[in-house]
């Protein structure tokens, strides 16, 4: 077959709009959230999804932008500054910090395109790296050398 | 910024190839790796990146597929079955499990496109959900009701 970059069919068939549509389905983390009696509290549950059973529990915050692809992103927000004790599930242990794990995700923003003489020629996609927080992790504090 | 090649402009402008090119820069998690004397061992370091300071430490494994966008994905692999003690950083605490946090990421596969009468018309992008493991999290084991 012919050399691959031609990603979408032959010239004149613009399916990038289709590509845009595909990507807008929100894809939150896999495990569905179940009700949590204290959804904003600093405690580690013994049931429910991973983010509520973690000893560095977190909640998800929706970040929606209709001019961005994907439109829906989710940011983790830590519910505790320190890690929760494995024994009690509620008391904090100052020997451990609850830290956000970040990721630079590639996103695309929809911007007006300008053709010749500044005429509006549909939309362009502008690629950006967008920082999202994935989860909260219980870590040992850094010991500065 | 310079115009990002009209991805979904007027009919007849096929720049989806350009969109493909943008997206291939590998974008692993933010914090760069630092030396780890026992890179594959079950211990929580007091320095280095988040994944080695975590009490549920993990490493990243590269998953490369030249027919997928993005081509490079990273899977977390837990280095311990249980969480590491905050006190020692090395002994495991059986009261906590080190569990993978999964995410269904939207990816695109390039597939031959077929035009009228089944003729090959370049490549199309097929949207898929692809399961990646983002991190290992220290959780309290589920108590079955």
């Amino acid at each position: 077959y012919s050399h691959w970059p031609s990603c979408c069919p032959s010239k004149g068939q613009d399916t990038s709009e289709e590509l845009l549509r595909w990507s807008t389905v929100p894809v939150p983390p896999l495990e569905p959230a179940r009700p949590n009696r204290h959804p904003e509290s600093c405690r580690a549950s013994e049931d429910g999804p991973l983010n509520s059973r973690a000893i560095s529990p977190w909640r998800y915050e929706l970040d929606r932008d209709l001019n961005r692809l994907p439109q829906d992103l989710y940011h983790a927000r830590c519910l505790c500054p320190h890690c929760v004790s494995l024994q009690t599930g509620s008391h904090m242990d100052p020997r451990g910090n609850s830290e956000l794990l970040y990721h630079n995700q590639t996103v695309f923003y929809r911007r007006p395109c300008h053709g010749e003489k500044g005429t509006h020629k549909g939309y362009c996609l502008e690629r950006r790296l967008y920082r999202v927080s994935l989860a909260c992790v219980c870590v040992r504090p850094r010991v500065m050398g | 910024y310079s115009h990002w090649p009209s991805c979904c402009p007027s009919k007849g402008q096929d720049t989806s190839e350009e969109l493909l090119r943008w997206s291939t820069v590998p974008v692993p998690p933010l914090e760069p790796a630092r030396p780890n004397r026992h890179p594959e061992s079950c211990r929580a370091s007091e320095d280095g990146p988040l994944n080695s300071r975590a009490i549920s430490p993990w490493r990243y494994e590269l998953d490369r597929d030249l027919n997928r966008l993005p081509q490079d994905l990273y899977h977390a692999r837990c280095l311990c079955p249980h969480c590491v003690s905050l006190q020692t950083g090395s002994h495991m605490d059986p009261r906590g499990n080190s569990e993978l946090l999964y995410h269904n990421q939207t990816v695109f596969y390039r597939r031959p496109c077929h035009g009228e009468k089944g003729t090959h018309k370049g490549y199309c992008l097929e949207r898929r959900l692809y399961r990646v493991s983002l991190a290992c999290v220290c959780v309290r084991p589920r108590v079955m009701g």
Epitope: - | R21, L62, R64
Partner: antibody, heavy 121, light 107 residues
Framework: EVQLVESGAEVKKPGASVKVSCKAS????????MNWVRQAPGQRLEWMGL????????SYNQNFKGRVTLTVDTSASTAYLELNSLRSEDTGVYYC???????????????WGQGTLVTVS | DIQMTQSPSSLSASVGDRVTITCSAS??????LNWYQQKPGKVPKLLIY???SLHSGVPSRFSGSGSGTDFTLTISSLQPEDVATYYC?????????FGQGTKLEIK
């Protein structure tokens, strides 16, 4: 100018381990993956694995049966190859090689270290 | 693993000759193939990437072609400095694999 400088020759006994270093300069170390390639005397080049210095992400050649560990020290722009349980057939020159890429087209080893001779006897 | 087989294993040609080296993959690899040149006692150098693209600084007498399973490296007019062993390498899937090499000498 891009340079990869490897550590000096090593002589090891069977069963021992060896650790080879590769110091990079002239480019952003975290921006490119680093490959390791072995060349035994009179043999073809053999890919051992690669590591992304940005996050320590690795891919290994399973033919080495878990004997290879790749690590990096980003603060020193240095990559390391450790090979355990050495045997005589591990004798050869070990190269680090930077991997260049151009989105959706290629991955290629565009700069190579001078090689480190490891002798197992 | 994908097996890469080069032919011939060695060849001798005269200065000015057109030289062709072939590389065959055990399964289709699209255009995901590179060629390296290793001069005696030296480090391998990237010659051609992605089947046919010349690496910077490589003379235009070198060219590459092919797709799928069969690939060719051509030197249009052999020069004395081209004496080396040439290796093909697939990057279609891990583990990356190399051909056994083709040793090129001057008659």
């Amino acid at each position: 100018e891009v340079q990869l400088v490897e550590s000096g020759a090593e002589v090891k006994k069977p069963g021992a381990s060896v650790k080879v270093s590769c110091k990079a300069s002239g480019y952003s170390f975290s921006g490119y993956t680093m490959n390791w390639v072995r060349q035994a005397p009179g043999q073809r080049l053999e890919w051992m694995g690669l590591i992304n210095p940005y996050n320590g992400g690795t891919s290994y050649n399973q033919n080495f049966k878990g004997r290879v560990t790749l690590t990096v020290d980003t603060s020193a722009s240095t990559a390391y190859l450790e090979l355990n349980s050495l045997r005589s057939e591990d004798t050869g020159v070990y190269y680090c090689a930077r991997e260049d890429f151009d989105s959706w087209t290629y991955f290629a080893m565009d700069y190579w270290g001078q090689g480190t001779l490891v002798t197992v006897s | 693993d994908i097996q890469m087989t080069q032919s011939p294993s060695s060849l001798s040609a005269s200065v000015g000759d057109r030289v062709t080296i072939t590389c065959s993959a055990s399964q289709g690899i699209h255009w995901n193939l590179n060629w390296y040149q290793q001069k005696p006692g030296k480090v391998p150098k990237l010659l051609i990437y992605y089947t046919s693209s010349l690496h910077s600084g490589v003379p235009s007498r070198f060219s590459g072609s092919g797709s799928g399973t069969d690939f060719t490296l051509t030197i249009s007019s052999l020069q004395p400095e081209d004496v080396a062993t040439y290796y093909c390498q697939q990057f279609n899937s891990f583990p990356y694999t190399f051909g056994q090499g083709t040793k090129l000498e001057i008659k």
